[in-house]
């Protein structure tokens, strides 16, 4: 299974914040060593407000000379976090976000953690491991996912409006039954998108309409009974 389609493994920490990681255990390291080194870049969607752990290539720490994490976030200078084994020293350059830290001491664990992922953590993260056998890289295109807030209401006769507010990426809205619809997208400066779908149903035997919002963080459906046409009193079906 290619890395870019790996499912997130989610667990609950003590403070009830979900954690996501693409790290592998030692057994997987043995089995997948050459494969992982070949597949150096991974696209990784992570839900906002969860914890994320990013891993270096599975190289034994005893073989290490230098570990460097390079972090490129939108609109910010490149941040680097380096650890030199020989002198047991760590160095940071242009790193201002206190939520991005080593998981523990880098001489024991080379992983990087992001505590409480925010939209601003969208970006590229790369671990570079310098060893006597050469340099090994592992990169992550981290895509922060934001669950949209979904609302459904009627604004006039047999017309309903479904909104997926401030999602990232943009949600997709579909309807049951299909109506005469117009969809607009509104882009916000923080990278989220609001999608608004307004539909009208001329067919009078449509009783209830369902708005289905599809999003990478999960799907949601809402339904609403349509108001009657003004002046319509009685009909047989």
């Amino acid at each position: 299974q290619p890395n870019n389609s790996l499912m997130l493994q989610t667990s609950k920490e003590n403070h009830a914040l979900a954690s996501s990681s693409l790290c592998m255990d030692e057994k997987q390291i043995t089995q997948n060593y050459s494969k992982v080194l070949a597949e150096v870049n991974t696209s990784w969607p992570v839900k906002m407000a969860t914890n994320a752990v990013l891993c270096c290539p599975p190289i034994a720490l005893r073989n290490l000379i230098i570990i460097t994490w390079e972090i490129i976030l939108r609109g910010q200078p490149s941040c680097t976090k380096a650890y030199k084994k020989e002198t047991n020293e760590t160095k940071e350059t242009n790193c201002t976000d206190e939520r991005i830290t080593w998981v523990s001491r880098p001489d024991q664990n080379s992983d990087l953690q992001i505590r409480t992922v925010a939209i601003t953590h969208d970006g590229y993260y790369r671990c570079i491991m310098v060893t006597p056998d050469g340099n090994f890289h592992r990169g992550y295109h981290l895509q922060v996912l934001v669950t949209p807030e979904v609302t459904l209401f009627q604004n006039r006769n047999r017309t309903a409006v479904c909104k997926a507010v401030a999602g990232k990426p943009a949600a997709h809205i579909s309807w049951i039954p299909e109506g005469d619809c117009a969809t607009k997208q509104e882009y916000w400066s923080n990278g989220t998108v609001t999608v608004k779908s307004t539909c009208h149903w001329e067919v009078h035997n449509v009783s209830t309409v369902t708005c289905h919002v599809s999003h990478l963080t999960g799907n949601k459906s809402l339904y609403i009974e349509l108001l009657p046409v003004p002046g319509a009193k009685k009909s047989a079906k």
Epitope: I176, P177, K233
Partner: antibody
Framework: QVQLVQSGAEVKKPGASVKLSCKAS????????MHWVKQAPGQGLEWIGN????????NYDEKFQGRATLTVDTSTRTAYMELSSLRSEDTAVYYC???????WGRGTLVTVSS | DIQMTQSPSSLSVSVGDRVTITCQAS??????LHWFQQKPGKAPKLLIS???NLEDGVPSRFSGSGSGTEFTFTISSLQPEDAATYYC?????????FGQGTKLEIK
Amino acid sequence: QVQLVQSGAEVKKPGASVKLSCKASGHTFTSYWMHWVKQAPGQGLEWIGNIYPGSGSINYDEKFQGRATLTVDTSTRTAYMELSSLRSEDTAVYYCLTMTGTSWGRGTLVTVSS
Amino acid sequence: DIQMTQSPSSLSVSVGDRVTITCQASQGTPINLHWFQQKPGKAPKLLISGASNLEDGVPSRFSGSGSGTEFTFTISSLQPEDAATYYCLQFTYIPWTFGQGTKLEIK
């Protein structure tokens, strides 16, 4: 919490009429359609029709058109269903329901017998 | 009118077993539906609204899935108190229509 309180059991003779009531509380009565459903003894559920209390707009299933009459009294938040020209096959429990079918009354048993 | 074909019409299952009931809408018309449980002498009780939403207070062994025209209701591990008749109801089009019901008995 939406509550629908239905009137008590009725025994009627063939050819007579019966008027059932359903008093609503816990929601905006005029903003939600009120539906009526029939269940004959040992049988399944059948939709009779619905009424929108805010405007009095009504839909009937063809099977009940002409014999069922749905009305509302918004001042007392009560929906009514009148069934005329009763026959034995009208013996059933009749339910009112609202909030897109998520809230039901307990039902009213109507027995048609000579 | 939309016809809802519910199957099976009856089944007899042992406690702890998995139960699956299906409802299919006619004419290939996409709809939305609810699932109800009804015990003798009682009004139908809503278990699953909008195809897959578990109602408050309903045990998690009940679930609903599907979309469009094909829907499934599942009891993951049957309990003695689950003996009842189960109905689907499509509420997208007038007239609203129910499935014929599935009578579930405990072996």
